[in-house]
């Protein structure tokens, strides 16, 4: 990695999380340089010999790429000149977790920054009214989580109430034997109330809300990654 730049440039990374079996992004930005051919981007992973990815002279150079990343990485080439060195990662695996370094070298100088990449599985929950039950109940389902999350219920009317005694949560291993389907049933629900099902592990937190009235059922779900930024 040659050193021709006289000073350091600012390189910024963001701690992020990858959802296994999907595309992931390792985020990295730097001070832009209009001379594309003078920009070198190197991604490294702690504990791995060879590079995760290299982009230089306006194109990818995978001559030193480690085999575990072959065919799985790409930079956003059209965004490099505006200072985007982020890396797209195909088919995220648990083993992709770790500390990555984004090295940048431009005509203005050089710099680097580390990022912590977490991997796991997280998905939106869906809450439905379970009419099969003897008394009215709610069923909260989320198809893919890893590591095993905690599940908690809350209610707008009974704020602060502990629903662990009137709920039942199960974890069913999915076909790839890593992720699990989360199912939680809340019993003895009352109408004209809003219930929330919260699923959380060390990577993500998801919440599903359901409002049950005489005339309608309203649902809302949200997912947030933890410790990002």
């Amino acid at each position: 990695f040659g050193i021709s730049g006289k000073h350091f440039i600012t390189v910024t990374t963001f701690t992020s999380a990858g959802n296994i079996g999907e595309d992931g992004t390792l985020s990295c930005t730097f001070e832009p340089d209009i001379k594309l051919n003078g920009i070198v981007i190197q991604w490294l992973k702690e504990g791995i010999k060879g590079l995760v990815h290299e982009f230089k002279e306006g194109k990818d150079d995978l001559s030193q790429q480690h085999e575990m990343f072959r065919g799985r990485t790409a930079v956003f080439a059209d965004q490099v000149v505006v200072g985007n060195a982020s890396l797209r990662l195909k088919n995220v695996q648990l083993t992709d977790a770790g500390t990555y370094t984004c090295y940048i070298h431009t005509s203005k100088g050089k710099g680097n920054a580390n990022l912590e990449y977490k991997t796991g599985a997280f998905s939106m929950p869906e809450i439905n009214v379970d009419y099969n039950a003897s008394s009215e109940s709610l069923r909260c389902e989320a198809p893919r989580w890893f590591p095993q999350p905690t599940v908690a219920w809350a209610s707008q009317v009974d704020q602060g109430a502990n629903f662990s005694e009137v709920s039942n949560t199960s974890f069913e291993l999915n076909s790839e034997n890593v992720t699990m389907k989360v199912v939680s049933v809340l019993y003895n629900v009352t109408i004209n109330n809003t219930y929330s099902c919260m699923i959380e592990n060390d990577i993500a937190k998801a919440t599903g809300d359901i409002k049950v009235t005489d005339s309608e059922v309203k649902r809302r779900s949200q997912l947030e990654l933890l410790n990002s930024g």
Partner: antibody, heavy 121, light 107 residues
Framework: EVQLVQSGAEVKKPGASVKVSCKAS????????IGWVRQAPGQGLEWIGD????????NYNEKFKGRVTITRDTSTSTAYLELSSLRSEDTAVYYC??????????????WGQGTLVTVSS | DIQMTQSPSSLSASVGDRVTITCKAS??????VAWYQQKPGKAPKLLIY???TLQPGVPSRFSGSGSGRDYTLTISSLQPEDFATYYC?????????FGQGTKVEIK
Amino acid sequence: EVQLVQSGAEVKKPGASVKVSCKASGYTFTSYWIGWVRQAPGQGLEWIGDIYPGGGYTNYNEKFKGRVTITRDTSTSTAYLELSSLRSEDTAVYYCARLAGSSYRGAMDSWGQGTLVTVSS
Amino acid sequence: DIQMTQSPSSLSASVGDRVTITCKASQGFNKYVAWYQQKPGKAPKLLIYYTSTLQPGVPSRFSGSGSGRDYTLTISSLQPEDFATYYCLQYGDLLYAFGQGTKVEIK
């Protein structure tokens, strides 16, 4: 515009070898994987393998290992598929295709016109 | 290696019909499933990739969905030009694999 132009039809005898070429234009040849797929008459599509022209890295369908070689010539932006020890069941249309996503191996988004290889004694 | 089992192998439908084709992966989970349309004597054409992303220029009547091991191609309202053979492809694994194909014929 991305274009993949393949070599012409071939007739070969059992036991022989065939080499099909695929000339790419309209994009940076060394930056995208190129895959090979075949289709026997009246049959479905069968993935053979692929190559990253920027480094020469290859992946092969286990079924063809030992009989197939995928190479490239970066000076002419051409990829090649060579299949040896030909048998009658290798009679098929052979397609080359560019994989989307640059160095990321994506789905095949641009295809050559196909090359018919006939194996007959 | 991941195999893709596609069904049905053929179907008859009329213009305006809603058509659904499914592919089941032999193992694992990933979203790397693409769908192709092929007409006789022509090269395949990419319709959908990454389970549900429509390739530019492909009509919106084509849609893809799925998760886990089960993936679906839906044509919401079959048009005369849609009569063709459709293939799924899994491209998440190191070794790619096509489904066996589904021929959509005129009823």
